[in-house]
Interface confidence: low
Amino acid sequence: KAMHVAQPAVVLANSRGIASFVCEYASPGKATEVRVTVLRQADSQVTEVCAATYMMGNELTFLDDSICTGTSSGNQVNLTIQGLRAMDTGLYICKVELMYPPPYYMGIGNGTQIYVIDPEPCPDSD
Amino acid sequence: KAMHVAQPAVVLANSRGIASFVCEYASPGKATEVRVTVLRQADSQVTEVCAATYMMGNELTFLDDSICTGTSSGNQVNLTIQGLRAMDTGLYICKVELMYPPPYYMGIGNGTQIYVIDPEPCPDSD
């Protein structure tokens, strides 16, 4: 079943390559387990950036080597992606799935365009 | 008389606060003198950033203290805005006027959203 997911249109990564945005979903029921997936769309290719399943009221747990971290609050998920470089600029899509209890719901946002600018290297300190 | 002006939707300033974009106009006639004005729209306020009048085939000449530089090639103007900070993020609109010979034509682009990220300061070199 479809579910509405909202996310900002544009976000700028900071000069350390970190970008944060909120993914908000309109829950049709009281879910206890939610899965959030971040997808990157570039040149009509869609790849999975990271994913986490969490119990409502608990922290999001991404894999140890994931570039994503996040926190949840009600129907909002605060996502942070780090280690971004200019070449990672692209459309980052938030996909939310309500896993438990049934019925299963899934929603996909329109995507957040994340812009990344590589910093100038600092001069060598002699 | 109206004239079509095209410019990119989004441009990122680099880490030195420099943003470049092309402003292209569909000239209805053979203009010898063209005026290009860059306007910034933010919070429904429109302010003039810089302006230059140039003869076709010659360099664009902005005022000495202008934050803009540019070159022209046919019906394209390559504009560069420097000294940008994060607070300068906004919609930069290209306005083109064909001044000579008559008739006078004017066109305004839809604007280029320039995003600017302030760089992290480099660590002190002790």
Epitope: - | E33, A51, G57, N58, P101
Partner: antibody, heavy 118, light 107 residues
Framework: QLQLQESGPGLVKPSETLSLTCIVS??????????WGWIRQPPGKGLEWIGT???????YYDPSLKSRVTISVDTSKNHFSLKLNSVTAADTAVYYC??????????WGQGTLVTVSS | EIVLTQSPATLSLSPGERVTLSCRAS??????LAWYQQKPGQAPRVLIY???NRATDIPARFSGSGSGTDFTLTISSLEPEDFAVYYC?????????FGQGTRLEIK
């Protein structure tokens, strides 16, 4: 050094045509950078722009004079001309030929007084 | 058309004094304003163009400022040869127009 020199009759009868020529020396009327124009100044009054021309394009005239004025340029003779027809006493003025560089007039002739009188 | 209004019409001052002449446009002309000086029996000569740029060979005591609708020409210390009529002129829009002039005379 660029020099502009107006020439033409100093007295014109009402309803006739005022004709002036500006001879350009030390520069070229076929320059892509410059425009050539006429400005007049009635006795004891201010400056009035008449019109401007570029060698490659059409002239542009003050709307109040447009129906009576013709400005042309002859690059082979390196001069440009003004014709103002159906003149009246109100057209009595010192007429200056000028070089226009984009937004301003950087060189002027010394001016010639044209009197409209019968 | 754009109307340029200069003030004052006449100004009486002494050599060495500082003077500020005003030119106001009936609508915004950005910085597309020039100032001219005209002495009796002579053609005008350009002093300032694009509101604040001094023309070639113009002394540093002449300066211009302003943008939009309000512009000023400042002479920091009047020299005897500065007593003349001063005109402003716009080329922001057609037709090209001049102000009516400010006469600067010796007190």
């Amino acid at each position: 050094q660029l020099q502009l020199q107006e020439s033409g009759p100093g007295l014109v009868k009402p309803s006739e045509t005022l004709s002036l020529t500006c001879i350009v020396s030390g520069g070229s009327t076929s320059s892509n950078t410059y425009y050539w124009g006429w400005i007049r100044q009635p006795p004891g009054k201010g400056l009035e722009w008449i019109g401007t021309i570029h060698y490659s394009g059409n002239p542009y005239y003050d709307p109040s004079l447009k129906s009576r004025v013709t400005i042309s340029v002859d690059t082979s003779k390196n001069h440009f001309s003004l014709k103002l027809n159906s003149v009246t006493a109100a057209d009595t003025a010192v007429y200056y030929c000028t070089r226009q560089y984009i937004n301003f007039f950087d060189f002027w002739g010394q001016g010639t007084l044209v009197t409209v009188s019968s | 058309e754009i109307v340029l209004t200069q003030s004052p019409a006449t100004l009486s001052l002494s050599p060495g004094e500082r003077v500020t002449l005003s030119c106001r446009a009936s609508q915004s002309i950005s910085r597309y304003l020039a100032w001219y000086q005209q002495k009796p029996g002579q053609a005008p000569r350009v002093l300032i163009y694009d509101a604040s740029n001094r023309a070639t060979d113009i002394p540093a005591r002449f300066s211009g400022s302003g943008s939009g609708t309000d512009f000023t020409l400042t002479i920091s210390s009047l020299e005897p040869e500065d007593f003349a009529v001063y005109y402003c002129q716009q080329r922001s829009n057609w037709p090209i127009t001049f102000g009516q002039g400010t006469r600067l005379e010796i007190k």
